[in-house]
Interface confidence: medium
Amino acid sequence: TALSPAPTTMDFTPAPLEDTSSRPQFCKWPCECPPSPPRCPLGVSLITDGCECCKMCAQQLGDNCTEAAICDPHRGLYCDYSGDRPRYAIGVCAQVVGVGCVLDGVRYNNGQSFQPNCKYNCTCIDGAVGCTPLCLRVRPPRLWCPHPRRVSIPGHCCEQWVCEDDAKRPRKTAPRDTGAFDAVGEVEAWHRNCIAYTSPWSPCSTSCGLGVSTRISNVNAQCWPEQESRLCNLRPCDVDIHTLIKAGKKCLAVYQPEASMNFTLAGCISTRSYQPKYCGVCMDNRCCIPYKSKTIDVSFQCPDGLGFSRQVLWINACFCNLSCRNPNDIFADLESYPDFSEIAN
């Protein structure tokens, strides 16, 4: 499928501390590494093994994993040992996705937003709770206030600045002739001065199969930079697109399977079917990357009845540019993104 075939288990059972005698030892010290690092298949990360010894090709979704043979961190995979009770020695690489969260004894579903108190707005994302403060930490009053102090005001959730003047009388606002404004005014002015910024999406973290693309945006209530992510799949790993290049041609810019399909992610299936386009490949050293694309929301339904949605890169068209670096270096494209002067057909 277009996103990934997914494991059926999503148990997050921690390994017990006792009964480790029967667990095999996968790490050997001192380290014994081959003279040269392995050559990884297209789209597979070259990483340091779990023993922190040697370079290895990261285990992929559905592969067996151990403390030494670790799952591809660039694809958001973890080693699920739940199928190897009670040894917890050999697991299966699974996608960390769609996992609920527990905060202060309260369970929240993946994707659920909530306010644990009046000061924070939180969201459960894949087992992690991310919170943004609702009380802006605005600057203290200006020079006219030598002793600013934050105090709780009855009936207000957020603390506010007050000024204690020489007579030790709290004063909430500035003298009228200073032209300064109180904390609320500063918040409003700060929002007026907030310049919205959204960075371009980074290149997909993998050259084939499921990857992640990120961007930074401050388009939010707080005007604070936050990282957004989307799933991406430039081309399937299990199709040899080279064989589809027509005789006499050097590139196939776009590959589109004939049949529509449902995306699957961590055992959950998209609620509608899609017929995605993928970027093709070249016979020479050129790379094919998206030219016209957008981000769509894909809704998934899980076997347990829960659902979630993910932002996904949707490819409309691709072009094949002139420079192609190591396809296993997922950060190479971040150095310089080709401009359209490099287009070649």
Epitope: K246, A253, V254, K294, N316, A317
Partner: antibody
Amino acid sequence: QMQLVQSGAEVKRPGASVKVSCKASGYSFTNFDINWVRQATGQGLEWMGWMDPNSGNSGSAPAFQGRVTMTRDTSIGTAYMELSGLTSEDTAVYYCARDDFYDSSGFDAWGQGTLVTVSS
Amino acid sequence: QSVLTQPPSASGTPGQTVTVSCSGRSSNVGSNTVDWYQHLPGTAPKLLIYSSNRRPSGVPDRFSGSKSGTSASLAISGLQSEDEADYYCAAWDDSLNVYVFGTGTKLTVL
């Protein structure tokens, strides 16, 4: 109801630039790409390029690269197409059209067209 | 010049069925869906068929589209006088990275 309303007719000198606007209403402006298509008198339809109002990303046909600039102002739901280095061959009716490329739904809404005349 | 080829003209009498052809390449019609537009003089073009054979709401079922390989066709049954217009096929071209229109067919209702 959904519609695209374009700016009025323009008369330009050769070498000058023209900027045509296209105001969208009745739908979410950032959810659909805006395309620009032109038709010279007695000629067929010619696609100039596309712009994604959400990201500002755009792409143009090779025939217009370096001459066409597509921008937008999401706060007022308006797309703009600026064509520079005008010649008499650029005399045409210019249309904006929206498409949801993700659903391959074609250009399902069009502006009324803007006549640009290039004459010395 | 256009990479989608259409006959310059077609004609028919009221009530007849007329077919307009559109010939392309593997990089456009062969690998992408085809759209059809009706263009009346002095008005904006109107989408008749999208995704090769689907009709937008409001388009009469007298209009139908089909695609086979690198060719597509538009069929208009029960021809009416108001169908007299220019008809264009169009498709995205993966090699050129452009949306290409056909050369256009002028339909005359006799």
